[in-house]
């Protein structure tokens, strides 16, 4: 898939920034706001941001520019530059208010059919588990295979470099076709098939990708928020996997939640399956030592481990993946809509 160009975005932050540069008032306000970075730190929800008056004024001036409301795309070129602009402008919109974080990513749903030739899988034993089958589907696709090998190499060996491994994981989940990436990670296993569950848990090479000692979850979030890409992915996840009511129904479509979830893999906030026997997921962090922020920490942790929206989205995608290999399909070759999902 070609990477989205700026022009395909409704209002790319890169384009909006160029427009702003052409206007002296906007340009000066943007530069001033950019220099306010250190004084407007990202507060924790429990903290009140303190904003200098001149920063407030610069923010006010930017509120009428096309920068307000500009967006980025998960697969665009210069994504990090776009996100840098987004978060600078975001300060103008929310003035450091943590609760007002909005995903920087524009929603684009691809409806391009994804062709799969299941007849190529006849080299596998008929009773092979589905995680093995989805891994084989990836191997049979040049792009998926190349990207998977790249992160496999970066994440293996006793002396793997975690930051290199994470970068390759990010690249895989960004550039591999979404159905391949989702099939690989969200493959269904029979309840007692520990081998399949182990394969699924090891998909993201947790021994290298995850921290050897679990950090505090709030510290992990602080670290994530200091990086525009990680912050963007976390906010995107919180936007699209947000359980909106007492029964935890997804605020947006399940497919958007899953895309946001996969977008976290390779960032500091990389989640994973917690065991071989079920589909529970969690961050690799702890709330021990959180002091009077224990409850806040548990709520952050719970956004992954106790999130009914995410749980249902994963379960629905796994049911869908099971159906791909059921006997209901009339032909060995068929097309699956890339955005198809149960809701």
């Amino acid at each position: 898939d070609p990477l989205p160009t700026e022009s395909r975005l409704m209002n790319s932050c890169l384009q909006a920034r160029r427009k702003c540069q052409a206007d002296p008032t906007c340009s000066a306000a943007y530069h001033h706001l950019d220099s306010c970075t250190s004084s407007i730190s990202t507060p924790l929800p429990s903290e009140e941001p303190s904003v200098p008056a001149d920063c407030l004024e610069a923010a006010q001036q930017l509120r009428n520019s096309s920068l307000i409301g500009c967006m980025c795309h998960r697969r665009m070129k210069n994504q990090v530059a776009c996100l840098d602009i987004y978060w600078t402008v975001h300060r103008a919109r929310s003035l450091g208010n943590y609760e007002l974080d909005v995903s920087p990513y524009e929603d684009t749903v691809t409806s391009k059919p994804w062709k799969m030739n299941l007849s190529k899988l006849n080299m596998l034993k008929p009773d092979s588990d589905l995680c093995l089958k989805f891994a084989m589907l990836c191997t049979l696709n040049d792009k998926c295979d190349r990207l998977r090998k790249a992160y496999g190499e970066a994440c293996s060996g006793p002396h793997c470099q975690r930051h290199v491994c994470l970068r390759q994981l990010l690249t895989f989940f960004e550039k591999a076709a979404e159905p391949h990436a989702q099939g690989l990670l969200l493959c269904p296993c029979a309840p007692n098939d520990r081998g399949c569950g182990e394969r699924r848990r090891n998909t993201i090479a947790p021994n290298c990708a995850l921290p050897p000692v679990a950090p505090n979850c709030l510290e992990l979030r602080r670290l994530c928020f200091s990086d525009p890409l990680c912050r963007s992915r976390l906010v995107d996840f919180q936007t699209h996997c947000h359980p909106m009511d007492i029964l935890g129904t997804c605020a947006t479509e399940q497919s958007r939640c899953l895309r946001a979830y996969l977008g976290l893999i390779g960032t500091a906030m990389t989640p994973n399956f917690v065991s071989n026997v079920n589909t529970s997921v969690a961050l690799s962090c702890t709330c021990r030592g959180s002091g009077n922020l224990q409850e806040e920490c548990e709520m952050l942790e719970g956004f992954f481990s106790h999130n009914p929206c995410l749980t249902e989205a994963i379960a629905a995608k796994m049911r869908f993946h099971s159906q791909l290999f059921s006997q209901d399909w009339p032909h060995p070759t068929f097309a699956v809509m890339a955005h198809q999902n149960e809701n």
Epitope: P243, D245, I246, L247, G248, V277, N278, S280, E295, E298, M299, E301, G302, S305, H306, N307, P308, T311, E312, A315
Partner: antibody, heavy 124, light 107 residues
């Protein structure tokens, strides 16, 4: 320590009203959805109602709909159950309960802290 | 409303026995099922949530399984403190409903 303490139970006649309270401590009350569950003497558990953290959403069991009203005062960390038009079949121990802190806003993961219960007897 | 049917209604067992309690929902509830233990005069205690996840502080001899309509609570080796009444509860849709309970008694 997380604690829920119910009060307000007592003996009333059919058709009368009663208001139960549940005082919460040890957690940020306004973050949590809350629930009332009751248990008639010698019988099983029956869910009564639930309220969102803000108090904006409430849901009721069919058996109490239109007669019971659940509310909360987040400034006082207190949950209420206003029971009107009471019937003999409302006789029960009433418990308030909260969901786990990792799932504070919804009840999909059960109720991990319960009060000790308050007894309501409706009899003529 | 979703009906939750628990069986058996009572079971007599000895310390060390394996005890299995089942709960059936009248319609699919995904994995949104909780199990509680209640002793006379006490409030219920959460044992299992989301069908199979063990609540913090609950002994590992308790386990839950199932999804959709059929669920199981298993006590692998019954201990003296496990003699109590056990309830399942669906948390998939309103109104929430409990099973009728299973009393585990000393044989």
């Amino acid at each position: 320590e997380v604690q829920l303490v119910e009060s307000g139970g007592g003996l009333v006649q059919p058709g009368e009203s009663l208001r139960l309270s549940c005082a919460a401590s040890g957690f940020t009350f306004s973050n949590y959805a809350m629930s009332w569950v009751r248990q008639a003497p010698g019988k099983g558990l029956e869910w009564v109602s639930v309220i969102s953290g803000s108090g904006g959403s409430t849901y009721y069991a069919d058996s109490v709909k239109g007669r019971f009203t659940m509310s909360r005062d987040n400034s006082k960390n207190t949950l209420y159950l206003q029971m009107n038009s009471l019937r003999a079949e409302d006789t029960a121990v009433y418990y308030c309960a909260k969901p786990p802190s990792r799932a504070a806003r919804y009840f999909n993961y059960g109720m991990d802290v319960w009060g000790q219960g308050t007894t309501v007897t409706v009899s003529s | 409303a979703i009906r939750m049917t628990q069986s058996p209604s009572s079971v007599s067992a000895s310390v060390g026995d394996r005890v299995t309690i089942t709960c059936r929902a009248s319609q699919g509830i995904s994995s949104w099922l909780a199990w509680y233990q209640q002793k006379p005069g006490k409030a219920p205690k959460l044992l299992i949530y989301a069908a199979s996840s063990l609540q913090s502080g609950v002994p590992s001899r308790f386990s839950g399984s199932g999804s959709g309509t059929d669920f199981t609570l298993t006590i692998s080796s019954l201990q003296p403190e496990d003699f109590a009444t056990y309830y399942c509860q669906q948390a998939n849709s309103f109104p929430f409903t409990f099973g009728g309970g299973t009393k585990v008694e000393i044989k």
